[in-house]
């Protein structure tokens, strides 16, 4: 007999990168007839909602209308259908941006490289911080963390046209509370190979996620997402 | 010390092919892309191309596209240019540099003569 | 392809001036600019990377500056053996391009 029902699926939109004092919605996905569904954060319970008709709703949305230092972190739901309960989600990790100021992120050797040359990006930023993020725009999005006190250095070690796109860094005091986005670098890989072994694993986002967090920062629109696997938060822990 | 060792000069006839080395040493031939770059006859630099010596990707200057042609031989931490259908207008010093961010390191240089 | 304009085109100089070189890109480079140094009869030489980060070895009478597309490269005091040729380098895109040269000589 089944003890426990599926694991809800939990997202933010219109992205989980949230300037603050925007508006943010916290979205869970579970089962028709769900009677229950209980948003948890860092742990606790957060947010409870009960969707009437429950045999026509799958989906519930937990609306945070002032996004702030205090509302970034880890989320979870689960829903309940009669007296089972689910599963708890994965852990969606909320992040606020704009808590300092922009970084400058820059490339070496140059945003122009060959095919095989050994390419670094450098996240620079003055005011006092810890923690560097380094992201790809795009569907196929790369995350990485850099740590230093005023500069990180992320190598991408030999890159590939796979590599190519734009890039921007953030500055960070902690997992959850970023800087403004630096300026975008734009990343050309040239060159044709015989050998194409070296192209990265890169982690994937099912929709550009950038491009929504984009809207988020200049019109604070809206804008409805596929829900994705989670691989970007897992990068963030 | 970084070492960028290139062949002696040469002095050819028009229409002719020609192949210049550039031997390096002291650093990882694999870990930095090779550039070439011609020096006419009192004038400024021009950049021909480069390549990546781990994998052999190349990029050139379309200006030398059908000209030059880059590779290099892993084994013995060499690059070379090879130049083909030449004309007077190929008569020039070409060196190889590292590129290191910038061109941090060059070739002493080699004098092409191209004369009938 | 970004053109790389150098001016003077010819400096001519005591020792002990400070003197400043001129280097314009036809389109923004960020700091992807590159000085280098090229004596008579010898292969260039780097001076300042990135527009304005020293080099080991090069005399500190050597900097740079600028960023975008107007750079300077400066000699605080010009020693005899600063003769020579001075090119600026666009490291941003391919293809990469070099100024047309500044020639330093003494008066």
């Known amino acids: 007999q089944q003890q426990t029902l599926p694991k809800p699926f939990i997202w933010a939109e219109p992205h989980f990168m949230v300037p603050k004092e925007k508006q943010v919605t916290i979205c869970c996905q579970g089962n028709y007839g769900a009677v229950e569904y209980q948003l948890h954060f860092e742990g606790s319970l957060f947010a409870v909602d009960r969707p009437k008709p429950p045999e026509r709703i799958n989906k519930v949305k937990f609306y945070i209308p002032d996004m702030n230092s205090r509302m970034a972190g880890q989320y979870s739901c689960i829903y309940r259908v009669g007296e089972l309960w689910s599963e708890p989600s994965n852990l969606l990790d909320l992040v606020v941006t704009e808590m300092a100021d922009t970084p400058t992120l820059s490339v070496h050797p140059g945003p122009e490289v060959i095919s095989g040359e050994k390419v670094t990006f450098y996240c620079r930023l003055d005011t006092a911080t810890s923690m560097f993020l380094l992201l790809k725009e795009g569907r196929s999005s790369h995350v990485q963390r850099g740590y230093g006190k005023v500069q990180a250095e992320f190598p991408l070690g030999p890159v590939t046209t796979a590599h190519r796109g734009t890039y921007r860094c953030f500055g960070s005091a902690n997992n959850h509370a970023w800087s403004f986005p630096s300026e975008p670098v734009k990343l050309l890989v040239t060159g044709d190979i015989e050998n194409t072994s070296l192209a990265p694993e890169d982690p994937t986002f099912p929709a550009d996620t950038w491009g929504t967090y984009l809207l988020t920062t200049e019109t604070g629109l809206q804008k409805d997402h596929a829900l994705w696997d989670h691989t970007a938060q897992n990068l963030l822990r | 010390e970084v070492q960028l060792q290139q062949s002696g000069p040469e002095l050819v006839k028009p229409g002719a092919s020609v192949k210049i080395s550039c031997k390096t040493s002291?650093?990882?031939?694999?870990?930095?892309?090779m550039h070439w770059v011609k020096q006419s006859h009192g004038k400024s630099l021009e950049w021909i191309g480069g390549i990546s010596p781990n994998i052999g990707g190349t990029s050139y200057n379309q200006k030398f596209k059908g000209k030059a042609t880059l590779t290099v031989d892993k084994s013995s931490s060499t690059a070379y240019m090879e130049l083909r259908s030449l004309t007077s207008e190929d008569s020039a010093v070409y060196y190889c540099a590292r590129r290191g961010g910038s061109f941090d390191y060059w070739g002493q240089g080699t004098t092409l003569t191209v004369s009938s | 392809d970004i053109v790389m304009t150098q001016s003077p085109a010819t400096l001519s100089v005591t020792p002990g001036d400070r003197v400043s070189l001129s280097c314009r890109a036809s389109?923004?480079?960020?700091?992807?600019l590159h000085w280098y140094q090229q004596k008579s009869h010898e292969s260039p030489r780097l001076l300042i990377k990135?527009?304005?980060q020293s080099i080991s070895g090069i005399p500190s009478r050597f900097s740079g500056s600028g960023s975008g597309s107007d750079f300077t490269l400066s000699i605080n005091s010009v020693e005899p053996e600063d003769v020579g040729v001075y090119y600026c380098q666009n490291g941003h895109s391919f293809p990469l391009t070099f100024g047309a040269g500044t020639k330093l000589e003494l008066k």
């Open positions: 389109q923004s480079i960020s700091d992807y």
């Open positions: 990135y527009a304005s």
């Open positions: 002291g650093y990882t031939f694999t870990e930095y892309t």
